[in-house]
Interface confidence: low
């Protein structure tokens, strides 16, 4: 099939005191090969500080996956989710408040 760019969604949730978990979800993309990783100060975090979900079919002939990491509250502006798919790449910041999230479709 033709290339379908991912929808990228960054959310945050409370973790332990002083920490938050930030999750970056990529959905509705094809083909399934994708790079999704958290960066701090513009450089990818090491694998041992991130958790990845499997790349799974979402029932529409496309795929979905996620990556999460735990960070200190107040340090959000240092972190971005980096996505690379079919030769295109994009970076997505952490939203500023608990109830906000960012949705971006990339063409």
């Amino acid at each position: 099939g033709s290339t379908v760019p991912p929808m990228v969604n960054v959310t945050r949730s409370e973790a332990s005191e002083g920490n938050i978990t930030v999750t970056c979800r990529a959905s509705s993309f094809y083909p399934r090969n994708i790079i999704l990783t958290w960066r701090q100060d513009g450089v990818s975090l090491s694998h041992d500080t991130q958790q990845w979900g499997d790349v799974l079919p979402d029932g529409n002939g496309t795929y979905q996956t996620w990556v999460a990491t735990r960070i200190c509250r107040g340090e959000e502006q240092r972190f971005t989710c980096y996505m690379e798919h079919s030769g295109n790449h994009s970076t997505h910041p952490v939203p500023s408040g608990n109830s906000h999230h960012h949705h971006h479709h990339h063409h």
Epitope: D41, G42, V43, S46, R78, T80, T91, P93
Partner: antibody
Amino acid sequence: EVQLVQSGAEVKKPGASVKVSCKASGYAFTSNNIYWVRQAPGQGLEWIGYIDPYIGRIIYNQQFKDRVTITADTSTSTAYLELSSLRSEDTAVYYCSRSGERSNFDYWGQGTLVTVSS
Amino acid sequence: EIVLTQSPATLSLSPGERATLSCSASSSISSNYLHWYQQKPGQAPRLLIYRTSNLASGIPARFSGSGSGTDFTLTISSLEPEDFAVYYCQQGGSLPLTFGQGTKVEIK
């Protein structure tokens, strides 16, 4: 080979502004942040701020926030530091540096001496 | 702000001797975020050790780093003439990014 080449020395009067450039080569400019650091004569290193050239995000050391502007031009792989309302204590060597693993400074420019004198 | 205090301010040693430089943080730092730099007169600093104990590219094995929490150490096992310089520690764990005030290693 990664290189950061900075603009030449500047002499400015108090109250003036200065803009220092840092041209990057040897790597994909948008894949790393550019940090700015200064070092007053005989003193230690002081982090000023950084820019993520890919999304244009800028983070400043609060100490410098009111007088510093950091920008980047991705078309020329060049980052800029502008410091306004200069005073004598701003006399220093200003360095640009590339972000490395875990927020270190892995490559440095040669430095730009800014002298503020009446 | 995390304050890094380096000691001693000056270390006077002879070539071939062992140098031990300390960096103490005002609050705990993950060892992943503590780095060391070397600076010679008239030159930019250069990355020496990253993530507490990893040698940067091209750095000789006589340099080593260790530590955790608030106390970190840079060791030069046997000083060469080119090692006489100023050494800075730096933390990247929280903003603002900060450096120690430096330790000067001079020829005795």
